[in-house]
Interface confidence: low
């Protein structure tokens, strides 16, 4: 199709080489067409025109994204050619940064239902640059945490070195929806709830004598509880002794509950005590069996192919540890009678 009639938008992504970060492009179809496709309508119901020139479907994923190769080749369907770019409804997610993401991206409706629709498309010229050392050293992270129940703030990484007074007007989106009230480089959250978690996008306009473009940054915000002040609990095994049958295989499970820590390095392992000897056992990998906001339950099993007389004289010890401390629980095997 002819892309000369597409509206054009220029975006700049300055990424940090120090951290992982993502980027998004919204299919910013001209108002009010966008509302038909992406439900990202910025107009209030009173402002919606009576006659829409572009009668699209309401299917949220009903847009097609293309990349325009720089050598003038035909447009390429994003989904077929770029595994690190994912389309989610009307948003294009770039999972990894890099200058190779620079280029022109075009979005348009999949279904062309009227002559007007042919020109209903947006061309986004994306320039991707690594952050220079001269840039602000302490810029806000692209991953930010908010402590549940407290006051918090979300900073726009590309503007976090500027004072509020110097900062240009910022447009914020949360999970693709415009946050029309927020205009500064920092969103202040009076009381943090779990629904404040999500993908935030901050845009501001930068101009020089020749042109203007939108500088965009993406912030992944997660809501967290405070770091635990306690060491892990062993939930299982509960009892100190376990009745077993000689010659039979046996699996003993160790389940431990670890409190939330931002830097989480849980340890869960089995070792065996036999008179004065003590050694760690090579056992299957630990697995997380339940994860909540406050804590995580991790399980690790010790497997004996066959219970022997010698095993009855040993103690099987589960050892769990976090940054606060460790807990152990030992199990003595006892032969089943009768």
């Amino acid at each position: 199709f002819n892309i000369s009639g597409c509206s054009t938008k220029k975006l700049l992504w300055t990424y940090s080489t120090r951290s992982e970060e993502e980027f998004v492009l919204f299919c910013d179809l001209p108002e009010p067409q966008k509302s038909h496709f992406c439900h990202r309508n910025r107009l209030s119901p009173k402002q919606v025109p009576e006659h829409l020139p572009f009668m699209g479907s309401n299917d949220l994923s009903d847009v097609q994204w293309y990349q325009q190769p720089s050598n003038g080749d035909p447009l390429e369907d994003i989904r077929k050619s770029y595994p690190h770019i994912i389309q989610d409804k009307c948003t294009l997610h770039f999972l990894t940064p890099g200058v190779n993401n620079s280029g022109s991206y075009i979005c348009r409706p999949k279904m062309i239902k009227s002559p007007y629709d042919v020109a209903c498309c947006v061309k986004m010229i994306l320039e991707v640059k690594p952050q220079t050392n001269a840039s602000c050293e302490y810029s806000a992270s692209h991953k930010q945490d908010l402590l549940l129940g407290s006051t918090g703030s979300i900073s726009c990484p590309s503007l976090s070195c500027q004072s509020d007074a110097q900062s240009p007007a910022v447009t914020w989106y949360k999970n693709g929806k415009l946050l029309s009230v927020e205009r500064s480089n920092r969103i202040v959250v009076d009381e943090v709830y779990d629904y404040h978690q999500g993908t935030y996008v901050c845009d501001y306009t930068q101009s020089d004598t020749v042109s203007s473009w939108t500088v965009r940054a993406v912030v992944q915000v997660r809501t967290i509880v405070g770091d635990t002040k306690l060491k892990p609990d062993i939930l299982d095994p509960v009892e100190d002794t376990l009745e077993v049958e000689l010659g039979k295989p046996l699996t003993i499970s160790c389940k431990a509950r670890f409190g939330f820590e931002r830097v989480f390095n849980p340890v869960i392992k089995w070792y065996i005590k036999d008179s004065d000897l003590e050694w760690e056992v090579s056992v299957p990998e630990a697995k997380s069996i339940k994860s909540t906001l406050k804590d995580e339950i991790i399980e690790r099993n010790i497997i004996l192919e066959k219970v022997t007389q010698r095993d009855l004289r040993r103690k099987f010890v589960c050892f769990v540890q976090n940054s606060i401390g460790n807990t152990t629980q030992s199990v003595q095997l006892k032969e089943k009678r009768g």
Epitope: T228, L230, D233, L235, D236, V238, E239, D295, Q329
Partner: antibody, heavy 121, light 111 residues
Framework: QEQLVESGGGLVKPGASLTLTCTAS?????????MCWVRQAPGKGLEWIAC????????TYYASWAKGRFTISKTSSTTVTLQMTSLTAADPATYFC?????????????WGPGTLVTVSS | DVVMTQTPASVSEPVGGTVTIKCQAS??????LAWYQQKPGQPPKLLIY???TLASGVPSRFSGSGYGTEFTLTISDLECADAATYYC?????????????FGGGTEVVVK
């Protein structure tokens, strides 16, 4: 035989303080379990107050209503105390000392007979 | 924190009958639930732990079932000695909290 015995209960005036003691016999506080205090007002249900981890980490847990006014401490390998301050008409109850395991295996759940606290002017 | 809701508050059944007491947790507590029997002037006595495991010395007339949020204590072949108040308790200890909470209790009257 493993046993818990509470002591220190009695009659106190409103606003007074009191310390209850739980003494263990037949075992000592050094494992992967908790020592807790639970109370029961006359004719009412059971109400958990606080727990302390039985090893030397001193990890404590309180019911939200008990924070600030009640303090649980491990004073030796066989004694745990509950300090209560600013006692009110809402505090009279039988106070039980309980040994508990995180996952609640039977041999770890052990209750003392209780000690009665009365608050009256 | 977890809230345990016990029903009914009171139940009356003849000797030889069956009593069913329900306990509902406000969130998933897996099988971390205990049942107690308490008689006047005595501390609670453990009947069942891990939702369905009978504590030692407890007659098999007592049985527990359930998982997650819904739990049941059943007493069959009621005897006069079963007249008491029964409590459920969440025995799941979190790491920053101990939701060591009890249900409100069910008084069992044996006629």
């Amino acid at each position: 035989q493993e046993q818990l015995v509470e002591s220190g209960g009695g009659l106190v005036k409103p606003g007074a303080s009191l310390t209850l003691t739980c003494t263990a016999s037949g075992f000592s506080f050094n494992g992967n379990y908790y020592m807790c205090w639970v109370r029961q007002a006359p004719g009412k249900g059971l109400e958990w107050i606080a727990c302390i981890y039985a090893d030397n980490s001193g990890s404590t847990y309180y019911a939200s209503w008990a924070k600030g006014r009640f303090t649980i401490s491990k004073t030796s390998s066989t004694t745990v105390t509950l300090q209560m301050t600013s006692l009110t008409a809402a505090d009279p109850a039988t106070y039980f000392c309980v040994r508990h395991k995180p996952a609640g295996g039977s041999s770890y759940i052990l209750w003392g007979p209780g000690t009665l606290v009365t608050v009256s002017s | 924190d977890v809230v345990m809701t016990q029903t009914p508050a009171s139940v009356s059944e003849p000797v030889g009958g069956t009593v069913t007491i329900k306990c509902q947790a406000s969130e998933d507590i897996e099988s971390y639930l205990a049942w107690y029997q308490q008689k006047p002037g005595q501390p609670p006595k453990l009947l069942i732990y891990s939702a369905s495991t009978l504590a030692s010395g407890v007659p098999s007339r007592f049985s527990g079932s359930g998982y997650g949020t819904e739990f049941t204590l059943t007493i069959s072949d009621l005897e006069c000695a079963d007249a008491a108040t029964y409590y459920c308790q969440c025995t799941l200890y979190g790491v920053n909290f101990v939701p060591n909470v009890f249900g409100g209790g069910t008084e069992v009257v044996v006629k």
